[in-house]
């Protein structure tokens, strides 16, 4: 597994922050784990990166992800409730120049090396629908969230608000 070495917390140096012409409102490093406390890890295999969901051995170091948070403005004519709305979007980068991507055709979550500006598939709408947990909804496919399936990350369709608390789309962020 790999992390981001030699990077200070809250760094802004790793990534040029002019993604799609907007600067992130904040960035920081955190480890990502599931609702059931399994760790999300990243491994280089055959020159491509694989993403795993696994139990770490005691004292095994958690992989860190650089989360970059963006504010997205929704005009009232789009928001449907007569007021301009803002939402938080996030990109997730476990190592320099690589970002998590939604592959909507394959219903998969992949790591891709990217040029700026990042494509929409690298952006996820942030939800916190449950105490101290977050969910990541595809910008490109509303109602589809990053989730856990067979010890891997996958894209999971959530068809009603009751299912927004399904444990397999809930994640915990930890800076320790």
């Amino acid at each position: 597994a790999f992390g981001i070495s030699g990077v200070q917390k809250y760094t802004r140096a790793l990534h040029d922050s002019s993604i799609t012409g907007i600067s992130p409102i904040t960035e920081y490093l955190a480890s990502l784990s599931t609702y059931n406390d399994q760790s999300i890890t990243f491994a280089l295999e055959d020159e491509s990166y694989e993403i795993y969901v696994e139990d770490l051995k005691k004292d095994e170091k958690k992989d860190k992800v650089l989360l970059s948070y963006y504010e997205s403005q929704h005009p009232s004519n789009e928001s449907g409730d007569g007021v301009d709305g803002k939402m938080l979007m996030v990109t997730l980068s476990p190592t320099k120049d690589f970002w998590l991507h939604a592959n909507n055709k394959e219903h998969s979550v992949e790591l891709h090396k990217c040029e700026k500006p990042l494509p929409d598939q690298a952006f996820f709408v942030l939800h916190n629908m449950h105490s101290n947990c977050v969910s990541f909804e595809c910008k490109t496919d509303p109602g589809v969230f990053i989730g856990v399936k067979d010890n891997h990350l996958a894209l999971i369709k959530v068809d009603s608000s009751e299912n927004l608390c399904t444990e397999n789309i809930l994640f915990k962020l930890s800076e320790t």
């Epitope: 409102i25 904040t26 916190n128 629908m129 101290n132 608000s161 608390c165």
Partner: antibody, heavy 121, light 107 residues
Framework: QVQLQESGPGLVKPSETLSLTCTVS????????VHWIRQPPGKGLEWLGV???????SYNSALMSRLTISEDISKSQVSLKLSSVTAADTAVYYC???????????????WGQGTLVTVSS | DIQMTQSPSSLSASVGDRVTITCLAS??????LAWYQQKPGKSPKLLIY???RLADGVPSRFSGSGSGTDFTLTISSLQPEDFATYYC?????????FGQGTKVEIK
């Protein structure tokens, strides 16, 4: 125009249940979380709980056994019930709306005017 | 629960003064911190969110800084309408706790 309006009895007897309603307009409860906060006279703010945009509810664990938050989406209302009240529950009760869709990370952008509830026999 | 400690609890200042209020979190909260202003008999008003972002309609003399555990609200040149009580709040974990407040009074 975003508006939140608290309503309910201003006087509640000890050991009874305090019931308040927050009626919202200008935004959708399916997109924004609504929080309850209280402020005892002359004191600071205490977060009580939230009805999140997806319909889930989070409570302050210190009050969880006495607190119930619910919604009536058709009436655009969020309700708070606090059971077994004592004089220590005397406070101005506020409801407030999240700054961001779907997320509480941005704080509370809009507040009701607050309603004073006195617990006394 | 995350404890939020504000200092000072009160301060006296004159119009035109630069005022700084600090907020210390008992554990890291990244940048998920908000600042509110409250005047007597009124509801709190959001000033700053995500530690540094100015809320809509808030004058630019207000600014926020910090990340992790240490945060600051600065009023660059105090105006008569700024005399009020200021609260910080963490939004990293529930319960979303507030600081105890800082009352800014006229000297």
């Amino acid at each position: 125009q975003v508006q939140l309006q608290e309503s309910g009895p201003g006087l509640v007897k000890p050991s009874e249940t305090l019931s308040l309603t927050c009626t919202v307009s200008g935004f959708s409860l399916s997109k924004y979380g609504v929080h309850w906060i209280r402020q005892p006279p002359g004191k600071g703010l205490e977060w009580l709980g939230v009805l999140r945009a997806g319909g889930t509810i989070s409570y302050n664990s210190a009050l969880m056994s006495r607190l119930t938050i619910s919604e009536d989406i058709s009436k655009s209302q969020v309700s708070l019930k606090l059971s077994s009240v004592t004089a220590a529950d005397t406070a101005v009760y506020y409801c407030a709306r999240d700054h961001y869709y779907y997320s509480s990370f941005g704080g509370f952008a809009s507040w009701g005017q607050g309603t004073l509830v006195t617990v006394s026999s | 629960d995350i404890q939020m400690t504000q200092s000072p609890s009160s301060l006296s200042a004159s119009v035109g003064d630069r005022v700084t209020i600090t907020c210390l979190a008992s554990q890291t909260i990244a940048t998920w911190l908000a600042w509110y202003q409250q005047k007597p008999g009124k509801s709190p008003k959001l000033l700053i969110y995500a530690a540094t972002r100015l809320a809509d309609g808030v004058p630019s003399r207000f600014s926020g800084s910090g990340s992790g555990t240490d945060f600051t609200l600065t009023i660059s040149s105090l105006q008569p309408e700024d005399f009020a009580t200021y609260y910080c709040q963490q939004l990293y974990n529930t319960p979303y706790t507030f600081g105890q407040g800082t009352k800014v009074e006229i000297k």
